[in-house]
């Protein structure tokens, strides 16, 4: 008597998530009498996938009619495949008895599920950094299979090379995750810059997924300060200007000090944007020279984006101002203690 063979012709089958998978199995003989059962996995922890005799298997249907006389084809179709269905499936022949006795197993068919990666999510640093500093951006995508995946980083369309990528887990799994961290050196011109994380996978048919992050969320461009004096007005008032230029973000507080005492505080708001995304702001202070006997030390103090204040001082020489109207002014910028603290 020829020994019964259980034939699973495919060693592996790959199916896209959502599709149906056909797992083929034929037997070489009609005897001995007994059922075929399908299992996922082997050993005591194996899961029963299909048993014609009993049980409810809504997603599994036999390919051919198993009740038909002389049927030797016990292939099954599993509908609406998900990554959780991945594994090795065994077609197992039992001999009829009480209970049925396991007789022979097929060699197994490994089902792998092709699943698309999720849209890449790019996150930037928690705190802003200034130009010339390096910041890290992280890109994450999940739920894809198979494991092979390509990830690229771009800054304003130019490919970046300083990044590190990990795909987890290392071994075989139903689905995988990718995490990549790119290091980007900031420049003062990066307010309008963008980093893009691009993920390519076999399931995407050459149309990669992209995640973006704006460098405007990561950068701080500290202001330049310049204090200048306009010519004396007819009413003995000197107009002193503090020009705050090329800063980002807009969050800025400017305080005028006269001889160390707070004269006025202003908050920047609704400023027009420069082409490069930075902002400028000009503040004026009128000083009544006739009200002072000595020189007046004016300080423009700027606190930008919660950083330590930056000062620029300027001395108005009272002695140099004759009291008659229309005379020229002689002003001297004494305070060059500008501090840019990052």
């Amino acid at each position: 008597e020829e020994e019964l063979q259980v034939i699973q012709p495919e060693k592996s089958v790959s199916v896209a998530a959502g599709d149906s998978a056909t797992l083929n199995c034929t037997v070489s003989s009609l005897i001995p009498v007994g059922p075929i059962q399908w299992f996922r996995g082997a050993g005591p922890g194996r899961e029963l996938i299909y048993n014609l005799k009993e049980g409810h298997f809504p997603r599994v249907t036999p390919v051919s009619d198993p009740t038909k006389r002389n049927n030797m084809d016990f292939s099954i179709r599993i509908s609406n495949i998900t990554p959780a269905d991945a594994g090795t499936y065994y077609c197992v022949k039992f001999r009829k008895g009480s209970p049925d006795v396991e007789l022979k197993s097929g060699a197994g068919t490994e089902l792998s599920v092709r699943a698309k990666p999720s849209a890449p999510v790019v996150s930037g640093p928690a705190v802003r950094a200034t130009a010339e500093h390096t910041v890290s951006f992280t890109c994450e995508s999940h739920g894809f299979s198979p494991r092979d995946i390509t990830l690229k980083w771009f800054k304003n369309g130019n490919e970046l090379s300083d990044f590190q990528t990990n795909v987890d887990p290392a071994g075989k799994s139903v689905s995988y995750s990718i995490r990549s961290t790119a290091r980007v050196v900031l420049t003062r011109r990066d307010v309008h810059s963008q980093v893009i994380c691009e993920v390519a996978h076999v399931t995407l048919q050459g149309d990669p997924l992209r995640g973006t992050a704006n460098l405007s969320e990561a950068i701080r461009v500290p202001p330049f300060l310049e204090v200048t004096q306009q010519s004396m007005r007819a009413d003995n008032q000197v107009n002193v200007t503090c020009q705050v230029t090329k800063f980002y973000p807009q969050r800025l507080q400017l305080t005028w000090l006269e001889n160390g005492n707070v004269s006025r505080t202003e908050m920047a708001s609704a400023l027009p944007e420069n082409k490069d995304g930075t902002y400028n702001w000009t503040s004026w202070l009128l000083v009544n020279v006739s009200a002072h006997r000595d020189d007046v030390k004016l300080t423009c103090q700027v606190e930008h984006d919660g950083q330590p204040a930056v000062n620029k001082s300027f001395s108005v020489k009272v002695s140099a101002h004759p009291k008659e109207q229309g005379s020229n002014t002689a002003a001297e910028n004494t305070g060059t203690n500008e501090r840019n603290i990052y």
Partner: antibody, heavy 122, light 112 residues
Framework: QVQLQESGPGLVKPSETLSLTCTVS????????WSWIRQPPGKGLEWIGF???????FYQSSLKSRVTISLDTSKNQFSLKMTSVTAADTAVYYC????????????????WGQGTTVTVSS | DIVMTQSPLSLPVTPGEPASISCRSS???????????LDWYLQRPGQSPQLLIY???SRASGVPDRFSGSGSGTDFTLKISRVEAEDVGVFYC?????????FGQGTKVEIK
């Protein structure tokens, strides 16, 4: 080449919980059983239990009420927790991989960790 | 539970000579599929056990061919055709047919 590495405290007080982790490197968690086996000083091998990659667990009946084996596929790790330990639980604890190709049985414990000595003492 | 019994428990050997260890199970390890769920392990001094034989007679990867396993049902034998000095240690048989997995008491092989 698959390697297994046990980690966890070497000394546990009586009545406390023993916690060990086994890290799988160079291979996959899938399609295998992941086992804990112990060996008391000068004695033979005692199977504690194992977990299949699908999460199904099997335990030694005498230890079942005290033992939990869990799997973290994202970290390629599996763990053993044993509550209410006594001096009788002092042993070298091995994590190991058990193969299963087809059928109901298993095909040998083919990869073993180097073992970690756990002493139960106050 | 399936009880595994080994004999002898101690085996003095001479390098170059053959040696054999017996193992008996309390119930048959020959499954209906024709597969025998019996494994042999060697634990060298200070080391973890290593798989020598699985399925009653199949040599594990990297195991020298001087080791062979035989038997079926409840009686099994591990043979070493020519003992080498590196073969010293404790040999265990183990069944993998059903949980709990069980092992024999071990046979200590030492050079005479």
């Amino acid at each position: 080449q698959v390697q297994l590495q046990e980690s966890g405290p070497g000394l546990v007080k009586p009545s406390e919980t023993l916690s060990l982790t086994c890290t799988v490197s160079g291979g996959s968690i899938r399609d295998y059983y992941w086992s804990w086996i112990r060996q008391p000083p000068g004695k033979g091998l005692e199977w504690i239990g194992f977990i299949y990659y699908n999460g199904r667990t099997f335990y030694q009946s005498s230890l079942k009420s005290r033992v939990t084996i869990s799997l973290d596929t994202s970290k390629n790790q599996f763990s053993l927790k044993m509550t209410s330990v006594t001096a009788a639980d002092t042993a070298v604890y091995y994590c190991a991989r058990v193969r299963a190709y087809s059928g109901i049985g298993l095909d040998g414990t083919d990869v073993w960790g180097q073992g970690t000595t756990v002493t139960v003492s106050s | 539970d399936i009880v595994m019994t080994q004999s002898p428990l101690s085996l003095p050997v001479t390098p170059g000579e053959p040696a054999s260890i017996s193992c008996r199970s309390s119930q048959s390890l020959l499954y209906s599929t024709g597969y025998t769920y019996l494994d042999w392990y060697l634990q060298r001094p200070g080391q973890s056990p290593q798989l020598l034989i699985y399925g009653g007679s199949s040599r594990a990867s990297g195991v020298p061919d001087r080791f062979s396993g035989s038997g079926s049902g409840t009686d099994f034998t591990l043979k070493i055709s020519r003992v080498e000095a590196e073969d010293v240690g404790v040999f265990y048989c183990g069944q993998a047919l059903q949980t709990p997995l069980t092992f024999g008491q071990g046979t200590k092989v030492e050079i005479k």
